[in-house]
Amino acid sequence: MMTGTIETTGNISAEKGGSIILQCHLSSTTAQVTQVNWEQQDQLLAICNADLGWHISPSFKDRVAPGPGLGLTLQSLTVNDTGEYFCIYHTYPDGTYTGRIFLEVLESSVAEHGARFQIP
């Protein structure tokens, strides 16, 4: 039975040209995390594997940095980066947990961080 929950940075906003940290945290389970995938809609951004380290998709290499931790840092943000991002935790024996983050990239300097929220 999957008992874990993923806590994410929730709905967040950031300024165009700036950077943002996408962060998820898996809790309430003793399952072992074997890999975390970061995806933007249906595009793979990065993989962090427990044994093999990081792999950043070539098309994002210039604007994506690994970490902190299992998180992902998006740099040089553009308005086109607005949208849904997913952290997909592959675990044993539970299976897959997915967290969702919505990022809005703003032209102005009124970018605010949303509250953290949980996805069961």
Epitope: A50, D51, L52, Y92
Partner: antibody, heavy 119, light 107 residues
Framework: EFQLQQSGPELVKPGASVKISCRAS????????MNWVQQTNGKSLEWIGV????????NYNQKFKGKATLTVDQSSSAAYIQLNSLTSEDSAVYFC????????????WGTGTTVTVSS | DIQMTQSPASLSASVGETVTITCRAS??????LAWYQQKQGKSPQLLVY???TLPEGVPSRFSGSGSGTQFSLKINSLQSEDFGSYYC?????????FGGGTKLEIK
């Protein structure tokens, strides 16, 4: 104390195979992945591959694919490397070294096994 | 594969001196760099990981710095037990690769 005890030195003929063991003690064997590293002529180090004792997943350095085969035996907390079709270029010291989950550096190293390939 | 270039290849110093070894990565490895010490006929030992973190038991005279592609290991007030070879290794993504090593000898 964490220890990785490796088998003794090997003198083998060209074309033969050799299997080296690495016995873990002092920690939970399946909680850490096991890497193998080659050191030629006391000089630099080359990563051969990694095996996850819990899941049996293996990843090889492209250079050593077909040359090295990694296995584990959970019941005896041992990891093994088999080296095939040996040539003089495979004469080296081979180390096992563990790494933690999402920690890709080697915090405990084996004692090393010298393999000499000579006719 | 990421190439790791270490310099100098060898270095002579006296007890009490401070020395610095550098390591350059062929591409950005952020802070995913480890340093190891190896004495003649022995196994390597972890000195630093994540570019600057010292594992428990490593003396504070060792310090690591750098990020991106340029890294260094500094040893303050050299002790006789510090002589040996030093290797850097990136731990960003497989295959893990090591620098060519720096042999630190007593002057």
């Amino acid at each position: 104390e964490f220890q990785l005890q490796q088998s003794g030195p090997e003198l083998v003929k060209p074309g033969a195979s050799v299997k080296i063991s690495c016995r873990a003690s002092g920690y939970s064997f399946t909680a850490y992945s096991m890497n193998w590293v080659q050191q030629t002529n006391g000089k630099s180090l080359e990563w051969i591959g990694v095996i996850n004792p819990k899941f049996g997943t293996i990843n090889y350095n492209q250079k050593f694919k077909g040359k090295a085969t990694l296995t584990v035996d959970q019941s005896s907390s041992a990891a093994y490397i088999q080296l095939n079709s040996l040539t003089s270029e495979d004469s080296a010291v081979y180390f096992c070294a563990r790494n933690g989950n999402f920690a890709w550096y080697f915090d405990v190293w084996g004692t090393g096994t010298t393999v000499t390939v000579s006719s | 594969d990421i190439q790791m270039t270490q310099s100098p290849a060898s270095l002579s110093a006296s007890v009490g001196e401070t020395v610095t070894i550098t390591c350059r990565a062929s591409e950005n490895i952020f802070s995913y760099l480890a340093w190891y010490q190896q004495k003649q006929g022995k196994s390597p030992q972890l000195l630093v990981y994540n570019a600057k973190t010292l594992p428990e038991g490593v003396p504070s005279r060792f310090s690591g710095s750098g990020s991106g592609t340029q890294f260094s290991l500094k040893i303050n007030s050299l002790q006789s037990e510090d002589f040996g070879s030093y290797y850097c290794q990136h731990h960003y993504g497989v295959p893990w690769t090591f620098g060519g090593g720096t042999k630190l000898e007593i002057k």
